[in-house]
Interface confidence: low
């Protein structure tokens, strides 16, 4: 959490961000809010990155003033235009870029004062890890699939019974490329499983931490499945 | 190529009983589970059970425990789906089908086994 | 059982129109959703499993998205030979269940 003061002495007012992360291809939320104002029109939003020469994306008198706005932005930002009033200034950046990592800062202009905060924004890929059981091999195996994933992650098998085995030795994980030339497919196989027993299939980079559960039983499959995004730190 | 290939429709009175065959070509029939699955006119599918065609293992859901019965003939590469106690609600299109892995999504169906309870 | 909701019901488009069809799980089923394409008369086929993976031999018009609860099938560009009914199935647990279906017809 990073918090901004302004920057005019008494006239100063608190702006808050969050770090976040934006998954390369979806949308992604640049977080900040305000101390609010009761009115919109006096209310003006700049969102500004370091290194860029343009504005991302500005916010006065009501409505979206994208004369400034840099290339690299046009048509890909918004904000939340009916919560402006309440004191969220939150960006929507449509389809993240690995271009748009980097130091952003949400600049706020109200009657009460002026204030600002940066935000570290990173970009790569993350997503859930599928875990299934492989019957096609000489032993039970298990075989963790996830489609994209940027930069290249760890991945790391852990067993509910065999608490801190090492698995490296009896797993095999390998990276394929995608047909985009960024993200990569992980796979991961897992041998000589035991029945009723859970493995846990871990994948991280340093954009997010990924986790796909299993439990076999001779008459069922349990699973669990759960993303995090690392380095959330607001400001 | 792999294929599944269900046995012809059924026209079977309430009461009685009836065998649906699915015979496996093209892969190694004791490397994959086969799944049952139930298609009423018009609906949605329904997810019957599995079998595991190495020791003939089952899964079904509660809702046909009872009514339908999963086996395999590992020699002829075939899965079997007894359904007893017929009324007209089991009249339906069935389906034999293979996930890609246990407990996955199925990429390869049959053509489907059309029973009239009648 | 989880339950699994689609929308549309149905759906009527044109050739050349994007199409967006919905599921959504009544828990989270993180990745493990897939989508299947049923013509009149036939089996289904699948079309995208882990929400997002397209299977063999589908054409690149199809696309799948989301985790956990929302999930979304695409269809650029529509096709005459698109015209079916799309399902959606999640295999969270042992018991699989399906949407209700989605029609697509074209106009």
């Known amino acids: 959490l990073i918090i901004g003061f302004g920057i005019s002495g008494r006239h100063s007012i608190t702006v808050t961000t969050v770090a976040s992360a934006g998954n390369i291809g979806e949308d992604g939320i640049l977080s900040c809010t305000f101390e609010p104002d009761i009115k919109l029109s006096d209310i003006v939003i700049q969102w500004l990155k370091e290194g860029v020469l343009g504005l991302v994306h500005e916010f006065k008198e009501g409505k979206d003033e994208l004369s400034e706005q840099d290339e690299m932005f046009r048509g890909r930002t918004a904000v939340f235009a009916d919560q402006v009033i309440v004191g969220n200034a939150s960006l929507r950046l449509k389809n993240v870029q690995l271009t748009d990592a980097g130091t952003y800062k949400c600049y706020i202009i109200t009657s009460k004062g002026k204030g600002n905060a940066n935000l570290e924004y990173k970009t790569g890929a993350f997503s859930m890890p599928e875990v299934n059981v492989d019957y096609n091999a000489s032993s039970e195996t298990l075989r963790c699939e996830a489609p994209r994933w940027f930069p290249q992650p760890t991945v790391v098998w852990a067993s509910q019974v065999d608490q801190g085995a090492n698995f490296s030795e009896v797993s095999n994980t390998s990276f394929e490329l995608n047909s985009e030339n960024v993200t990569m497919k992980v796979v991961s196989v897992l041998y000589n499983v035991t029945i009723n027993n859970t493995y846990s299939c871990m994948i991280e980079n340093d954009i997010a931490k990924a986790t796909g559960d299993i439990k076999v039983t001779e008459s069922e499959i349990k699973r669990r499945s759960h993303l995090q995004l690392l380095n959330s730190k607001a400001s | 190529e792999v294929q599944l290939q269900q046995s012809g429709p059924e026209l079977v009175k309430p009461g009685a009983s009836v065998k649906i065959s699915c015979k496996a070509s093209?892969?190694?029939?004791?490397?994959?589970?086969m799944n049952w699955m139930k298609q009423s006119h018009g609906k949605s599918l329904e997810w019957i059970g599995d079998i595991n065609p190495n020791n003939g293992g089952t899964s079904y859901n509660q809702k046909f425990k009872g009514k339908a019965t999963l086996t395999v003939d590992k020699s002829s590469s075939t899965a079997y789906m007894e359904l007893r106690s017929l009324t007209s609600e089991d009249s339906a299109v069935y389906y034999c089908?293979?996930?890609?892995?246990?407990?996955?999504?199925?990429?390869?169906w049959g053509q489907g086994t059309t029973l009239t309870v009648s | 059982d989880i339950q699994m909701t689609q929308s549309p019901a149905s759906l009527s488009a044109s050739v050349g129109e994007t199409v967006t069809i919905t599921c959504r799980a009544s828990e989270n089923i993180g990745s493990y959703l897939a989508w299947y394409q049923q013509k009149q008369g036939k089996s289904p086929q699948l079309l995208v499993y882990?929400?997002?993976l397209l299977a063999d031999g589908v054409p690149s018009r199809f696309s799948g998205s989301g985790s956990g609860t929302q999930f979304s099938l695409k269809i650029n560009s529509l096709q005459s030979e698109d015209v079916a009914r799309y399902y959606c199935q999640h295999y969270y647990s042992t018991l699989v269940t399906f949407g209700a279906g989605t029609k697509l017809e074209l106009k």
């Open positions: 089908a293979r996930p890609y892995y246990y407990g996955s999504s199925y990429d390869y």
């Open positions: 093209g892969y190694t029939f004791t490397d994959y589970y």
């Open positions: 882990a929400a997002t």
